[in-house]
Interface confidence: low
């Protein structure tokens, strides 16, 4: 196979979030992030090769303690396919409960044109520190 | 490509920790750990091939309950490149808050000669159980 | 190499759990799960190719809050090789403490014929939502 498509993205909030969708970026200005194959469209990741991917994410809440996290519960992160609408599905979901970081990963089939959305519901702010919040995919096999 | 460089390491603390750096080991005496390509130098992992790597870690605190973790907060784990100094950067960071285990993973570019450090700050000790604390890398693409 | 063996499984509880072993399934009826190489045997995953695998898991407890998790502590998840008996070992273990989700991953050598077991000890039930509880493996190298 040609080189596997991969991407590792950093949070790219440039305005206060008015909707739950996290917007991502890649490139020298955003730590050690990159896209090799997949493409960013308005801060969301679009897949360019069919296959099974390992999707991973870590999100840390800013200015957070277990008390904060508990008081502002439920704060939930969901990763899913948001377009095309016909393929819309939640792939991975986690709640923060009394913690300030969630991290997980899973294998999932993705198709060319699938756009991945990451939604953080609740009132707390995600940290933009490049070692605390990141999102990535790695093509594994057809 | 030749076989991807990979390593899976176990904690190799032989004395009480006097500094925050965790020291790792591999081989038959340490569970199912191994190094195929990267090399251990004084308990730290040195990369031998440029590329994008999946770095993953799990650390469990020994003799820990949510009360202990909370009382000894902040206990934080950071994984980073510590040498060469010109490339020093924190790659991945998590705090324990009221939990006793952190686990995460991320894709990151690493270069031949990069040495990875894992620092556990705080007063709690990590568990050496081979299924509770481990650290590894997997080469993904150039 | 031929295509890497991979599997991504969903929880397939059909009866109330009377033993701690989680039973998994794959296929169209269970979200976006699949087996490419490994095989399911009575809800447990059997490996069909020797090599180093990335094993990952996420388990979310059903009807859970940090209070529930704390009150029902210890709730622990362990992933291991359960047969053949000569190779029985715990590979990965996490406790829930005051959280309702655990997620982790590790690299480990597995051999053809190894059967992986996932045991959830405690009184709480795992969520069967396909984006909350899943288990998978990915062959990485010989």
């Amino acid at each position: 196979h040609p080189e596997p498509h991969t991407a590792e993205l950093q949070l790219n909030l440039t305005v206060p979030r008015k909707d739950p969708t996290l917007r991502w970026g890649a490139g020298p200005a955003l730590g050690r992030s990159f896209t090799h194959g997949p493409e960013l469209d308005k801060g969301q990741l679009r897949i360019h090769r069919d296959g099974i991917y390992m999707v991973h994410i870590q999100v840390t809440l800013a200015i957070c303690s277990s008390t904060t996290a508990s008081r502002h519960h439920p704060t939930t992160l969901a990763v899913g396919i948001c377009s095309p609408a016909s393929r819309s599905i939640s792939l991975l979901r986690l709640s923060f409960h009394q913690g300030c970081t969630i991290a997980s990963q899973r294998l999932t089939p993705l198709a060319r044109g699938d756009t991945l959305c990451t939604n953080l519901t609740g009132t707390l702010l995600p940290s933009r520190n490049t070692d605390e919040t990141f999102f990535g995919v790695q093509w594994v096999r057809p | 490509h030749p076989e991807p460089h990979t390593a899976e390491l176990q904690l190799n603390l032989t004395v009480p920790r006097k500094d925050p750096t965790l020291r790792w080991g591999a081989g038959p005496a340490l569970g199912r750990s191994f190094t195929h390509g990267p090399e251990l130098d004084k308990g730290q992992l040195r990369i031998h091939r440029d590329g994008i790597y999946m770095v993953h870690i799990q650390v469990t605190l020994a003799i820990c309950s949510s009360t202990t973790a909370s009382r000894h907060h902040p206990t934080t784990l950071a994984v980073g490149i510590c040498s060469p100094a010109s490339r020093s950067i924190s790659l991945l960071r998590l705090s324990f808050h009221q939990g006793c285990t952190i686990a995460s993973q991320r894709l990151t570019p690493l270069a031949r000669g990069d040495t990875l450090c894992t620092n556990l700050t705080g007063t709690l000790l990590p568990s050496r159980n081979t299924d509770e604390t481990f650290f590894g890398v997997q080469w993904v693409r150039p | 190499h031929p295509e890497p063996h991979t599997a991504e499984l969903q929880l397939n509880l059909t009866v109330p759990r009377k033993d701690p072993t989680l039973r998994w399934g794959a296929g169209p009826a269970l979200g976006r799960s699949f087996t490419h190489g490994p095989e399911l045997d009575k809800g447990q995953l059997r490996i069909h190719r020797d090599g180093i695998y990335m094993v990952h898991i996420q388990v979310t407890l059903a009807i859970c809050s940090s209070t529930t998790a704390s009150r029902h502590h210890p709730t622990t998840l362990a992933v291991g090789i359960c047969s053949p008996a000569s190779r029985s070992i715990s590979l990965l273990r996490l406790s829930f403490h005051q959280g309702c989700t655990i997620a982790s991953q590790r690299l480990t050598p597995l051999a053809r014929g190894d059967t992986l077991c996932t045991n959830l000890t405690g009184t709480l039930l795992p969520s069967r939502n396909t984006d909350e509880t899943f288990f998978g493996v990915q062959w990485v190298r010989p």
């Epitope: 979030r17 800013a62 200015i63 957070c64 502002h72 009132t123 702010l125 933009r128 | - | -």
Partner: antibody, heavy 122, light 111 residues
């Protein structure tokens, strides 16, 4: 107990410069976003600027953009505001304020200093 | 001209209830404006009371409550006390990246 103590205010001529400082204690300074908010005599509050916890991201009100610079030194638990090209309308009590982190949308100020008065007059 | 509008002054009797409002010069206030309320007594720094429309900050007595009333944000004080006499500022999120404060309401507790 959270304490924020501002200093550096005083009388300055139009076009002049001042540097305000805010010394923080009683909390882990390096994890909080910090802000400057000002209040002209007998008037309401006006948000001036904020900086993220690690110092890499800053925002400014349009009224001060290009003239004021916010910065921080986490090793000294200190926040700064460098004010250049000062105008009469910058006359105000300047407060250092901590963002509680209660919202991902807006700064919410849960701790304030007592303020330092800046008077711009010829 | 202020974008965020508040009553310049209000009066309440001890033990009484008073509602302070916070509006937009043009348009309605919704929870998407994340209304926040601060209290300031003379010579003191402001103090956070309510955020995200209706969440009380820790240590704030439950006689203070926040809501959306019609097209405005509202701060209601029930069982007013003498030490509630202060100026109250609301803050709204209107545009990136700041908050806009209202001109303040001077509350007098007739004693």
């Amino acid at each position: 107990e959270v304490q924020l103590v501002e200093s550096g205010g005083g009388l300055v001529q139009p076009g002049g410069s001042l540097r305000l400082s805010c010394a923080a204690s009683g909390f882990t300074f390096s994890v909080y976003y910090m802000n400057w908010v000002r209040q002209a005599p007998g008037k309401g509050l006006e948000w001036v600027s904020d900086i993220n916890n690690e110092g890499g991201t800053t925002y400014y009100a349009d009224s001060v953009k290009g003239r004021f610079t916010i910065s921080r030194d986490n090793s000294k638990n200190s926040l700064y505001l460098q004010m250049n090209s000062l105008r009469a309308e910058d006359t105000a009590v300047y407060y250092c304020a901590r963002d509680a982190g209660y919202s991902n949308h807006v700064p919410i100020f849960d701790s304030w200093g007592q303020g330092t008065l800046v008077t711009v007059s010829s | 001209q202020a974008v965020v509008t508040q009553e310049p002054s209000l009066t309440v009797s001890p033990g009484g209830t008073v509602t302070l409002t916070c509006g937009l010069k043009s348009g309605s206030v919704t929870s998407d404006n994340f209304p926040t309320w601060y209290q300031q007594t003379p010579g003191q720094a402001p103090r956070l009371l309510i955020y995200n429309t209706n969440t009380r900050h820790s240590g704030v007595p439950d006689r203070f409550s926040g809501s959306i009333l019609g097209n405005k944000a509202a701060l209601t004080i029930t069982g007013a006390q003498a030490d509630d006499e202060a100026e109250y500022f609301c803050a709204l999120f209107i545009s990136n990246p700041s908050v806009e404060f209202g001109g303040g309401t001077q509350l007098t507790v007739l004693g």
